[in-house]
């Protein structure tokens, strides 16, 4: 059957996949869509109710923070 992730298991998966980057429950504003009226897609919609793979999870990781310079 479809591989879904919900609740605490979804949070665990996001924390693991995103490592030290952190993650969003909703894609950042403007992510993957030029329409301001497009409804914001959330990870729960995408992974709890539909098949969810690692690439889908990675889309909700925060960007890598640039290394601090001296």
């Amino acid at each position: 059957g479809p591989e879904t992730l919900c609740g605490a298991e979804l949070v665990d998966a996001l924390q693991f996949v995103c490592g030290d980057r952190g993650f969003y429950f909703n894609k950042p504003t403007g992510y993957g869509s030029s329409s301001r009226r497009a409804p914001q897609t959330g990870i729960v919609d995408e992974c709890c109710f539909r098949s969810c793979d690692l690439r889908r999870l990675e889309m909700y990781c925060a960007p890598l923070k640039p290394a601090k310079s001296a």
Partner: antibody, heavy 123, light 107 residues
């Protein structure tokens, strides 16, 4: 070059907790590019992924074992550990620790393995 | 979980032969598949990742192909050191799962 070495008791009694440690040498466990995992192989059988850990301590476990598994990392010792509780004879296996490419590569494969350690569950 | 199946479960071949092993996933996994070689008493060794990319240091006689649900590992000219068991692994979904293995032995 980087190497992994498992250590821990080779014999565990039923209902007790199996404890293993993997020592990383020749490199740092604190790499944003890599994850660290445990895989086991019962004698004469195939491979089963137990779970993985990131250097920050975040974990993800195979749901089939989740209720019995705990993983931890000690960056000061360059080690990560596995605990498997309430073991039975079915947990008898060779346990491998492995390095896994993570999100920065987008692949999630095990590119470096320890030699493995046989753990027998018997009274 | 995604179930991985391999065929054949074992194959007998001679040095110089070409051998092809098939791996099938119970649902589509794009190209997120790896192949490992394991010799008796040793740890698995990564051969191929991303279905067709050769891991550094692995001889070019090993090649991988496929996407979606069907994948193959081909050893173009079998060498004595290639007699081993080969496993596929999907890296598309949690939990990561392996095929049951294909043993390549001497005819």
């Amino acid at each position: 070059q980087l190497q992994l070495q498992e250590s821990g008791p080779g014999l565990v009694k039923p209902s007790e907790t199996l404890s293993l440690t993997c020592t990383v040498s020749g490199g740092s466990i604190r790499s944003s590019s890599y994850y660290w995992g445990w895989i086991r192989q019962p004698p004469g059988k195939g491979l089963e992924w137990i779970g993985g850990i990131y250097y920050s301590g975040s974990t993800y476990y195979n749901p089939s074992l989740k209720s019995r598994v705990t993983m931890s990392v000690d960056t000061s010792k360059n080690q990560f550990s596995l605990k498997l509780s309430s073991v039975t004879a079915a947990d008898t296996a060779v346990y491998y620790c492995a390095r896994q490419r993570g999100h920065s590569s987008g692949w999630w494969y095990f590119d470096l393995w320890g030699r493995g350690t046989l753990v027998t569950v018997s009274s | 979980d995604i179930q991985m199946t391999q065929s054949p479960s074992s194959v007998s071949a001679s040095v110089g032969d070409s051998v092809t092993i098939t791996c099938r996933a119970s649902q589509g996994i794009s190209s997120y598949l790896a192949w490992y070689q394991q010799k008796p008493g040793k740890a698995p060794k990564l051969l191929i990742y991303a279905a067709s990319s050769l891991q550094s240091g692995v001889p070019s006689r090993f090649s991988g192909n496929g996407s979606g649900t069907d994948f193959t590992l081909t050893i173009s000219s079998l060498q004595p050191e290639d007699f081993a068991t080969y496993y596929c692994q999907q890296a598309n979904n949690f939990p990561f799962t392996f095929g049951p293995g294909t043993k390549v032995d001497i005819k």
